[in-house]
Interface confidence: medium
């Protein structure tokens, strides 16, 4: 199981950070990077449900983005495998109270960082 910093939440060998603050998508990723993490990569339906449960009602950026006409990709460059629907026509994904949606990168939202637990 995950051994995470105190402000983070452990779930299935990963650590997640939920922000209070709001930033645009790029600044959110910059923050996560400063914490040796990335905007959250969601790798299973269980993980998605965990994040939806913990984040509360606010929208939170996650680590999915796309170039115009290109497929969704995670921060690490791997393609999104359509584990869940992403609504909207934006280029950056976020979690809302129902699931995932998308918006323009410059809009401000809370965010979720994730990192693998290296202490396991």
């Amino acid at each position: 199981q995950a051994a995470c910093p105190e402000s983070w939440i452990g779930f299935q060998r990963k650590c997640f950070y939920f922000s209070d603050d709001t930033k645009n998508w790029t600044s959110s990723q910059r923050f996560c990077d400063s914490q040796d993490a990335d905007l959250a990569q969601v790798e299973s339906f269980q993980e998605l449900n965990f994040l939806l449960r913990y984040k509360g009602p606010s929208d939170h950026w996650i680590g999915l983005s796309r170039e115009q006409g290109q497929p969704w990709k995670w921060i690490n460059g791997t393609e999104w495998t359509r584990q869940f629907p992403i609504l909207g026509a934006g280029e950056c994904a976020y979690l809302n109270d129902k699931g995932a949606s998308s918006a323009r990168h410059y809009t401000e939202r809370k965010w979720i960082c994730s990192k693998s637990d290296i202490h396991v």
Partner: antibody
Framework: QITLKESGGGLVQPGGSLRLSCTVS????????MTWVRQTPGKGLEWVAN????????HYVDSVKGRFTISRDNAENSLYLQMNSLRGEDTAVYYC??????????WGQGTLVTVSS | DIVMTHTPLSSPVTLGQPASISCRSS???????????LSWLHQRPGQPPRLLIY???TRFSGVPDRFSGSGAGTDFTLKISRVEAEDVGVYYC?????????FGHGTKVEIK
């Protein structure tokens, strides 16, 4: 259903020792930091100590440093507080609590420790 | 250590009316990670405390929406929009930004 249950409290003489236990169920114990908090009628609620998921990080309030030791056994879903060199001012109800995002989100019912001669 | 100061220490309230409790910290509770780790707890006589609000304004699961938290820096407020009989007891603020974690002495809410 998440439950935390403390045990091990009782009457002990000044200078004596006690070991408190907290057994949990209903969540993955090894995923959470855990905390001991005590409550006295005079001083109210006082944070005592906390411990990281894997036990590698521990913090204590100054008044118990060197006397109390927090530990955990993830295989047994148990949290412990070894209390040595007990003093009258350690008399309190001791609660274990689960940490989540630096809040104390679930609490046990508490166990009473009385230090008196 | 961070000192957490409640006002008022006691608050007689009328059922169905709003109530407000304040908590002030002796220094800022904003963490370097951008979050503010200020929680509110409620304790009824003979029971352990229970979490109402964490990170200033996030309601814990199962907490009625008549409870809300606000504030920043050093000044924080818990509001009850319509007091119900079950809301009596002592309300505590607690900070978890700095070590040691510290609690306020509490505000006792009782029905007029």
């Amino acid at each position: 259903q998440i439950t935390l249950k403390e045990s091990g409290g009782g009457l002990v003489q000044p200078g004596g020792s006690l070991r408190l236990s907290c057994t949990v169920s209903g969540f993955t114990f090894s995923n959470n930091w855990m905390t001991w908090v005590r409550q006295t009628p005079g001083k109210g609620l006082e944070w005592v100590a906390n411990i990281k998921q894997d036990g590698t990080e521990k913090h204590y309030v100054d008044s118990v440093k060197g006397r109390f030791t927090i530990s955990r056994d993830n295989a047994e879903n148990s949290l412990y507080l070894q209390m040595n060199s007990l003093r009258g001012e350690d008399t309190a109800v001791y609660y274990c609590a689960r940490n989540s995002q630096r809040s104390f989100d679930y609490w046990g019912q508490g166990t009473l420790v009385t230090v008196s001669s | 250590d961070i000192v957490m100061t409640h006002t008022p220490l006691s608050s007689p309230v009328t059922l169905g009316q709003p109530a407000s409790i304040s908590c002030r910290s002796s220094q800022s509770l904003e963490h370097t990670d951008g979050n503010t780790y200020l929680s509110w707890l409620h304790q009824r006589p003979g029971q352990p405390p229970r979490l109402l609000i964490y990170k200033v304004s996030t309601r814990f699961s199962g907490v009625p929406d008549r409870f809300s938290g606000s504030g920043a820096g050093t000044d924080f407020t818990l509001k009850i929009s319509r007091v119900e009989a079950e809301d009596v007891g002592v309300y505590y603020c607690v900070q978890a930004t700095h070590y040691p974690r510290t609690f306020g002495h509490g505000t006792k809410v009782e029905i007029k």
